[in-house]
Amino acid sequence: AVRSLHCRLQDAQQKSLVLSGTYELKALHLNAENLNQQVVFSMSFVQGEESNDKIPVALGLRGKNLYLSCVMKDDKPTLQLESVDPNRYPKKKMEKRFVFNKIEIKDKLEFESAQFPNWYISTSQTEYMPVFLGNNSGGQDLIDFSMEFVSS
C-alpha cells in the first residue's frame, strides 16, 4: 500500500491554492473567513529514481479523483489536473507524468516534474493566476512552497 499524508501548500508569497472550475488550480491570497477554500493535497510517497535530496511524490486532491500530472501540450511541458480511477489510485508505481521530485531545503519545498526535469510546479507573482509548470528561466515565477499538515 502507498503511504500518503494530507497537507496544504502555500507559495512564497503566502498565496493559497484553490480549485477553480473542475480542472484548474489558482493561487490567491485568502483571508481568515475563506481559508477553508484552499485545496487539501494527498501527498503520496511513490517509487521513483534514487536520489539523496529528491523524494518522489504524487499530489492528489483529497476527496477528489484528481492528480496533478505533467504532459506535453503544444510542444510545452504543461501542468494539469487529471481524473483517475479511484479504485486504482494512488498506487506505489505511479505513471511518470504523476510523479514530482520533492526537494526540501529548510522547510521550503519545490516540486520538480519527474517527466520534465528542471520544470517545477510554479505560481505567478500576480493574484488569481493558474498554477503551472515553469522552468524558472525568467526568475519571476515562484517555485518554493511551505507545507502545513492536515489531519487525515
Partner: antibody, heavy 120, light 107 residues
Framework: QVQLVQSGAEVKKPGASVKVSCKVS????????IEWVRQAPGKGLEWIGE????????NYNEKFKGKATITADTSTDTAYMELSSLRSEDTAVYYC?????????????WGQGTLVTVSS | DIQMTQSPSSLSASVGDRVTITCKAS??????LSWFQQKPGKAPKSLIY???RLVDGVPSRFSGSASGTDYTLTISSLQPEDFATYYC?????????FGQGTKLEIK
Amino acid sequence: QVQLVQSGAEVKKPGASVKVSCKVSGYTFSRYWIEWVRQAPGKGLEWIGEILPGNGNINYNEKFKGKATITADTSTDTAYMELSSLRSEDTAVYYCSTIYYDYDQGFTYWGQGTLVTVSS
Amino acid sequence: DIQMTQSPSSLSASVGDRVTITCKASQDIDRYLSWFQQKPGKAPKSLIYRVKRLVDGVPSRFSGSASGTDYTLTISSLQPEDFATYYCLQYDEFPYTFGQGTKLEIK
C-alpha cells in the same frame, strides 16, 4: 543536536497501566514521525506504532492495538505511549525513535529506552 | 506481514576480518531497509538507511547493498568496537518488521 529523552524505569503490577514519555529537542517536532519499539529481555526488536505530531496521524502494529495508545503534545515536544492491562509478557525496554515525515531517512535517532517491569 | 529473515544468527570473527550479514525480505520493500547496531544495555544505533546510505558519523567501513529482495550489510575490516548485535528493519509496509538479529562475537 537531536536528543530524545525518555522517562525513567517503571515497575507495575499486572492489570495496571503505564505511560512512557519521549521528550525531543533539536529538530522540528511536527515534521518527524515518533516511532515506538519494544525489546523483551534477551529478545529482538518489535515495532509498536508511530505518530506524526504535525497532524496527529497514527499507525499501529495490529498486534498492539488495544494494548498501546500513542499520543503527542506539540506544546512540549513530547510523545507518549500508554500501555494498558499490563501482563508479565509486557516486561520490556521500550524505545522511541524518529523518522522524517517522508520516510526517507530511517530511524535515525533513538531515546535511551525505558524499562517497564510487570511483576506481582 | 513482511518477514525479514536475517542470517546468520551469530557469527564469530576477528579484528580486521570482512563480514557480511544478510536479510531477505518476503516481498518487495522498495529499498526501505535500514541497519542498526546494538550493544548490551544500550539503544540501537542507526548505521544505514535506504539500503546503502550511511548515517552521518558512521565509519565508511560499513556499507549496504541489495540484490532483489536480499539486503546485505558489510563491514570491510572489523574493529574491536564493532562486536555487537546487528538488526535490519523494513519500513515500507505496516507493520514495520525487524530481522531476528545477528550477534557478532570475537573469535
